[in-house]
Interface confidence: medium
Protein backbone atom coordinates (compact mmCIF):
# COMPACT_ATOMS: atom_id res chain seq x y z
CA UNK A 1 0.00 0.00 0.00
CA UNK A 2 2.87 2.32 0.90
CA UNK A 3 4.48 1.55 -2.48
CA UNK A 4 1.27 2.51 -4.28
CA UNK A 5 1.09 5.77 -2.29
CA UNK A 6 4.73 6.52 -3.11
CA UNK A 7 4.05 5.75 -6.78
CA UNK A 8 1.10 8.16 -6.88
CA UNK A 9 3.10 10.87 -5.10
CA UNK A 10 6.09 10.37 -7.37
CA UNK A 11 3.90 10.59 -10.46
CA UNK A 12 2.21 13.75 -9.19
CA UNK A 13 5.59 15.27 -8.33
CA UNK A 14 6.97 14.35 -11.76
CA UNK A 15 3.93 15.98 -13.44
CA UNK A 16 4.51 19.20 -11.49
CA UNK A 17 8.20 19.19 -12.43
CA UNK A 18 7.31 18.50 -16.06
CA UNK A 19 4.87 21.40 -16.14
CA UNK A 20 7.38 23.73 -14.48
CA UNK A 21 10.09 22.65 -16.88
CA UNK A 22 7.86 23.10 -19.95
CA UNK A 23 6.75 26.49 -18.61
CA UNK A 24 10.36 27.55 -18.12
CA UNK A 25 11.28 26.45 -21.63
CA UNK A 26 8.31 28.29 -23.11
CA UNK A 27 9.15 31.43 -21.11
CA UNK A 28 12.73 31.23 -22.29
CA UNK A 29 11.71 30.80 -25.93
CA UNK A 30 9.26 33.69 -25.73
CA UNK A 31 11.91 35.90 -24.12
CA UNK A 32 14.29 35.21 -26.95
CA UNK A 33 11.52 36.25 -29.36
CA UNK A 34 9.61 33.32 -30.84
CA UNK A 35 10.19 33.51 -34.59
CA UNK A 36 11.95 36.75 -33.83
CA UNK A 37 15.55 37.04 -34.86
CA UNK A 38 17.17 35.79 -38.02
CA UNK A 39 19.14 32.56 -38.21
CA UNK A 40 18.96 29.17 -39.84
CA UNK A 41 17.94 25.87 -38.33
CA UNK A 42 19.75 22.56 -38.14
CA UNK A 43 22.00 21.74 -41.01
CA UNK A 44 22.79 25.34 -41.88
CA UNK A 45 26.47 26.10 -42.05
CA UNK A 46 28.13 29.12 -40.51
CA UNK A 47 28.15 31.19 -43.70
CA UNK A 48 26.90 34.77 -43.41
CA UNK A 49 23.18 35.13 -44.05
CA UNK A 50 23.89 37.45 -46.98
CA UNK A 51 25.72 34.58 -48.68
CA UNK A 52 22.90 32.13 -48.03
CA UNK A 53 20.18 34.33 -49.53
CA UNK A 54 20.74 37.39 -51.67
CA UNK A 55 17.26 38.80 -51.19
CA UNK A 56 16.99 40.38 -47.73
CA UNK A 57 13.20 40.30 -47.62
CA UNK A 58 13.17 36.62 -48.50
CA UNK A 59 15.86 35.94 -45.88
CA UNK A 60 13.77 37.74 -43.28
CA UNK A 61 10.51 35.89 -43.84
CA UNK A 62 12.15 32.53 -44.55
CA UNK A 63 14.29 32.68 -41.40
CA UNK A 64 11.30 33.78 -39.35
CA UNK A 65 9.39 30.80 -40.71
CA UNK A 66 12.32 28.46 -39.95
CA UNK A 67 12.52 29.72 -36.42
CA UNK A 68 8.80 29.37 -35.82
CA UNK A 69 8.99 25.82 -37.13
CA UNK A 70 11.94 25.07 -34.84
CA UNK A 71 10.03 26.36 -31.83
CA UNK A 72 6.83 24.52 -32.78
CA UNK A 73 8.81 21.33 -33.31
CA UNK A 74 10.52 21.77 -29.97
CA UNK A 75 7.31 22.49 -28.06
CA UNK A 76 5.57 19.61 -29.80
CA UNK A 77 8.41 17.30 -28.75
CA UNK A 78 8.46 18.52 -25.14
CA UNK A 79 4.72 18.73 -24.58
CA UNK A 80 3.87 15.76 -26.84
CA UNK A 81 6.19 13.47 -24.89
CA UNK A 82 4.48 14.46 -21.66
CA UNK A 83 1.00 14.01 -23.11
CA UNK A 84 1.89 10.51 -24.37
CA UNK A 85 3.37 9.65 -20.97
CA UNK A 86 0.18 10.81 -19.20
CA UNK A 87 -1.99 8.72 -21.54
CA UNK A 88 0.29 5.70 -20.92
CA UNK A 89 0.09 6.21 -17.16
CA UNK A 90 -3.72 6.49 -17.30
CA UNK A 91 -3.89 3.26 -19.32
CA UNK A 92 -1.95 1.42 -16.62
CA UNK A 93 -4.55 2.17 -13.94
Amino acid sequence: RRDVAHGILNEAYRKVLDQLSAGKHLQSLVARGVGGSLGGGAGDDAEPLSKRHSDGIFTDSYSRYRKQMAVKKYLAAVLGKRYKQRVKNKGRR
Epitope: Q27, A31, R32, S37, L38, G39, A42, S63, K67
Partner: antibody, heavy 115, light 110 residues
Framework: VEESGGRLVTPGTPLTLTCTVS????????MCWVRQAPGKGLEWVGF?????SAYYASWAKGRFTFSKTSTTVDLKIASPTTEDTATYFC??????????????WGPGTLVTVSS | DIVLTQTPASVSAAVGGTVSISCQSS????????LSWFQQKPGQPPKLLIY???TLASGVPSRFEGSGSGTQFTLTISDVQCDDAATYYC??????????FGGGTEVVVK
Protein backbone atom coordinates in the same frame (compact mmCIF):
# COMPACT_ATOMS: atom_id res chain seq x y z
CA VAL B 1 26.73 48.23 -34.91
CA GLU B 2 28.07 51.35 -33.21
CA GLU B 3 27.78 52.66 -29.65
CA SER B 4 27.84 56.33 -28.65
CA GLY B 5 27.19 58.51 -25.60
CA GLY B 6 30.05 57.38 -23.39
CA ARG B 7 31.63 60.22 -21.40
CA LEU B 8 32.87 61.32 -18.01
CA VAL B 9 30.00 61.80 -15.54
CA THR B 10 29.77 62.43 -11.82
CA PRO B 11 28.13 59.77 -9.62
CA GLY B 12 24.34 60.00 -9.69
CA THR B 13 24.15 61.82 -13.04
CA PRO B 14 21.85 59.87 -15.40
CA LEU B 15 23.47 58.73 -18.63
CA THR B 16 22.09 57.26 -21.84
CA LEU B 17 24.16 55.22 -24.28
CA THR B 18 22.93 54.63 -27.81
CA CYS B 19 23.61 51.71 -30.13
CA THR B 20 22.93 52.43 -33.79
CA VAL B 21 22.55 49.55 -36.24
CA SER B 22 22.39 49.29 -40.01
CA UNK B 23 22.15 46.40 -42.47
CA UNK B 24 19.64 44.44 -40.40
CA UNK B 25 16.34 45.09 -38.66
CA UNK B 26 15.76 45.45 -34.94
CA UNK B 27 12.29 44.04 -35.47
CA UNK B 28 13.89 40.68 -36.25
CA UNK B 29 16.96 40.67 -34.01
CA UNK B 30 17.55 40.82 -30.27
CA MET B 31 20.28 43.20 -29.06
CA CYS B 32 22.55 42.62 -26.09
CA TRP B 33 24.57 44.95 -23.87
CA VAL B 34 27.89 43.77 -22.44
CA ARG B 35 30.33 45.81 -20.38
CA GLN B 36 33.99 45.57 -19.44
CA ALA B 37 35.62 47.47 -16.58
CA PRO B 38 39.22 48.60 -17.28
CA GLY B 39 41.55 45.59 -17.14
CA LYS B 40 38.68 43.25 -16.19
CA GLY B 41 36.58 40.56 -17.90
CA LEU B 42 33.34 40.78 -19.86
CA GLU B 43 30.05 41.17 -18.02
CA TRP B 44 26.63 40.53 -19.57
CA VAL B 45 24.16 43.33 -18.76
CA GLY B 46 21.05 42.07 -20.57
CA PHE B 47 19.16 42.23 -23.84
CA UNK B 48 16.11 43.72 -25.50
CA UNK B 49 14.26 41.35 -27.78
CA UNK B 50 12.63 41.87 -31.16
CA UNK B 51 9.29 42.45 -29.42
CA UNK B 52 10.72 45.28 -27.27
CA SER B 53 10.79 43.24 -24.04
CA ALA B 54 13.91 43.81 -21.92
CA TYR B 55 15.71 41.20 -19.82
CA TYR B 56 18.46 42.06 -17.36
CA ALA B 57 21.22 40.26 -15.51
CA SER B 58 20.20 39.69 -11.88
CA TRP B 59 22.75 42.27 -10.68
CA ALA B 60 21.60 44.84 -13.27
CA LYS B 61 17.86 44.91 -12.52
CA GLY B 62 16.74 48.38 -11.46
CA ARG B 63 20.07 49.93 -12.36
CA PHE B 64 19.72 49.88 -16.14
CA THR B 65 16.87 50.40 -18.60
CA PHE B 66 16.80 49.35 -22.24
CA SER B 67 14.61 50.88 -24.92
CA LYS B 68 14.69 51.03 -28.70
CA THR B 69 13.53 52.68 -31.92
CA SER B 70 13.62 51.19 -35.42
CA THR B 71 17.40 51.68 -35.75
CA THR B 72 18.70 52.37 -32.25
CA VAL B 73 18.88 50.66 -28.87
CA ASP B 74 19.38 52.77 -25.74
CA LEU B 75 20.86 51.82 -22.39
CA LYS B 76 20.04 54.23 -19.59
CA ILE B 77 22.02 54.23 -16.35
CA ALA B 78 19.70 55.95 -13.89
CA SER B 79 22.21 56.69 -11.16
CA PRO B 80 25.76 55.73 -12.13
CA THR B 81 28.31 54.80 -9.48
CA THR B 82 32.08 54.46 -9.83
CA GLU B 83 31.53 50.70 -10.29
CA ASP B 84 29.79 51.45 -13.59
CA THR B 85 33.03 52.75 -15.10
CA ALA B 86 33.52 50.49 -18.12
CA THR B 87 33.50 50.15 -21.87
CA TYR B 88 29.94 49.31 -22.94
CA PHE B 89 29.46 47.06 -25.96
CA CYS B 90 26.32 46.48 -27.96
CA UNK B 91 26.02 43.15 -29.78
CA UNK B 92 23.51 41.42 -32.01
CA UNK B 93 22.00 38.43 -30.18
CA UNK B 94 20.87 35.78 -32.63
CA UNK B 95 19.33 32.48 -31.66
CA UNK B 96 17.72 29.36 -32.98
CA UNK B 97 16.57 26.20 -31.23
CA UNK B 98 20.02 24.87 -32.15
CA UNK B 99 22.22 27.69 -30.88
CA UNK B 100 22.49 31.25 -29.63
CA UNK B 101 25.27 33.65 -30.58
CA UNK B 102 26.48 37.22 -30.20
CA UNK B 103 27.71 37.60 -33.73
CA UNK B 104 28.06 41.33 -34.47
CA TRP B 105 29.71 43.72 -32.02
CA GLY B 106 30.23 47.46 -31.91
CA PRO B 107 33.64 48.92 -31.00
CA GLY B 108 32.35 49.99 -27.57
CA THR B 109 31.92 53.32 -25.81
CA LEU B 110 33.75 54.27 -22.61
CA VAL B 111 31.85 55.49 -19.57
CA THR B 112 33.85 57.00 -16.71
CA VAL B 113 32.08 57.74 -13.45
CA SER B 114 34.16 59.92 -11.18
CA SER B 115 33.72 62.79 -8.78
CA ASP C 1 23.68 32.08 -8.75
CA ILE C 2 25.14 30.33 -11.77
CA VAL C 3 28.94 30.29 -11.95
CA LEU C 4 30.94 29.75 -15.13
CA THR C 5 34.51 28.81 -14.26
CA GLN C 6 37.22 29.15 -16.87
CA THR C 7 40.62 27.47 -16.44
CA PRO C 8 43.45 28.20 -16.60
CA ALA C 9 43.48 31.97 -16.03
CA SER C 10 46.63 32.21 -18.15
CA VAL C 11 48.45 29.82 -20.44
CA SER C 12 51.66 30.00 -22.42
CA ALA C 13 52.05 28.21 -25.74
CA ALA C 14 54.76 27.77 -28.34
CA VAL C 15 54.06 28.53 -31.99
CA GLY C 16 52.75 25.33 -33.58
CA GLY C 17 51.67 23.92 -30.23
CA THR C 18 48.22 23.16 -28.83
CA VAL C 19 46.24 24.98 -26.14
CA SER C 20 43.13 23.77 -24.30
CA ILE C 21 40.86 26.04 -22.29
CA SER C 22 38.18 24.60 -20.05
CA CYS C 23 34.83 26.14 -19.16
CA GLN C 24 32.76 24.56 -16.40
CA SER C 25 29.24 25.67 -15.53
CA SER C 26 27.51 25.13 -12.21
CA UNK C 27 24.29 24.48 -14.19
CA UNK C 28 23.57 23.10 -17.65
CA UNK C 29 23.45 25.71 -20.38
CA UNK C 30 20.21 26.04 -22.32
CA UNK C 31 19.59 23.13 -24.70
CA UNK C 32 22.93 21.70 -23.42
CA UNK C 33 24.77 23.57 -26.19
CA UNK C 34 24.11 27.31 -25.79
CA LEU C 35 27.78 27.98 -25.17
CA SER C 36 29.97 30.37 -27.18
CA TRP C 37 33.67 31.19 -27.25
CA PHE C 38 35.13 34.63 -27.95
CA GLN C 39 38.58 36.02 -28.65
CA GLN C 40 39.44 39.53 -27.48
CA LYS C 41 42.54 41.58 -28.18
CA PRO C 42 43.40 44.80 -26.29
CA GLY C 43 41.33 47.79 -27.42
CA GLN C 44 39.02 45.63 -29.54
CA PRO C 45 35.54 44.18 -29.07
CA PRO C 46 35.21 40.42 -28.58
CA LYS C 47 35.15 38.31 -31.73
CA LEU C 48 32.86 35.27 -31.95
CA LEU C 49 34.83 32.07 -32.56
CA ILE C 50 32.49 29.21 -31.68
CA TYR C 51 28.75 29.04 -31.00
CA UNK C 52 26.41 26.16 -30.22
CA UNK C 53 29.36 24.64 -28.30
CA UNK C 54 31.06 23.35 -31.46
CA THR C 55 30.02 25.34 -34.54
CA LEU C 56 32.79 27.44 -36.05
CA ALA C 57 31.78 31.05 -36.74
CA SER C 58 32.21 32.41 -40.25
CA GLY C 59 35.82 33.19 -41.20
CA VAL C 60 37.33 31.47 -38.15
CA PRO C 61 40.19 29.06 -38.95
CA SER C 62 39.53 25.37 -38.32
CA ARG C 63 42.48 25.36 -35.88
CA PHE C 64 39.87 26.49 -33.34
CA GLU C 65 37.66 23.70 -32.07
CA GLY C 66 34.87 23.70 -29.51
CA SER C 67 33.59 20.62 -27.74
CA GLY C 68 31.48 19.62 -24.75
CA SER C 69 27.87 19.57 -23.64
CA GLY C 70 25.75 20.42 -20.61
CA THR C 71 28.13 21.79 -18.00
CA GLN C 72 31.60 21.01 -19.33
CA PHE C 73 33.13 22.65 -22.42
CA THR C 74 36.56 22.96 -24.01
CA LEU C 75 38.13 25.29 -26.55
CA THR C 76 41.16 23.76 -28.30
CA ILE C 77 43.55 25.81 -30.41
CA SER C 78 45.88 23.61 -32.46
CA ASP C 79 48.88 24.78 -34.49
CA VAL C 80 48.98 27.98 -32.39
CA GLN C 81 49.99 31.14 -34.28
CA CYS C 82 51.40 34.45 -32.97
CA ASP C 83 48.09 36.07 -33.95
CA ASP C 84 46.27 33.83 -31.43
CA ALA C 85 47.75 35.79 -28.50
CA ALA C 86 44.61 37.20 -26.85
CA THR C 87 42.16 36.70 -24.01
CA TYR C 88 39.50 34.05 -24.58
CA TYR C 89 36.06 34.01 -22.96
CA CYS C 90 33.29 31.44 -22.81
CA UNK C 91 29.66 32.58 -22.58
CA UNK C 92 26.82 30.44 -21.29
CA UNK C 93 23.20 31.12 -22.17
CA UNK C 94 20.71 29.71 -19.65
CA UNK C 95 17.04 28.79 -19.40
CA UNK C 96 16.56 31.45 -16.72
CA UNK C 97 17.12 34.02 -19.51
CA UNK C 98 20.54 34.99 -18.29
CA UNK C 99 23.92 34.92 -20.03
CA UNK C 100 27.12 34.58 -18.04
CA PHE C 101 30.73 35.04 -19.15
CA GLY C 102 33.61 33.00 -17.85
CA GLY C 103 36.46 34.88 -16.17
CA GLY C 104 38.68 34.76 -19.25
CA THR C 105 41.92 33.00 -20.19
CA GLU C 106 44.95 34.90 -21.39
CA VAL C 107 46.89 33.04 -24.06
CA VAL C 108 50.53 34.06 -24.40
CA VAL C 109 52.37 32.84 -27.50
CA LYS C 110 56.13 32.32 -27.29
Amino acid sequence: VEESGGRLVTPGTPLTLTCTVSGFSLSTYNMCWVRQAPGKGLEWVGFINSDDSAYYASWAKGRFTFSKTSTTVDLKIASPTTEDTATYFCARYDWDYYYSRLDLWGPGTLVTVSS
Amino acid sequence: DIVLTQTPASVSAAVGGTVSISCQSSESVYNNNYLSWFQQKPGQPPKLLIYGASTLASGVPSRFEGSGSGTQFTLTISDVQCDDAATYYCLGDYIIIENIFGGGTEVVVK
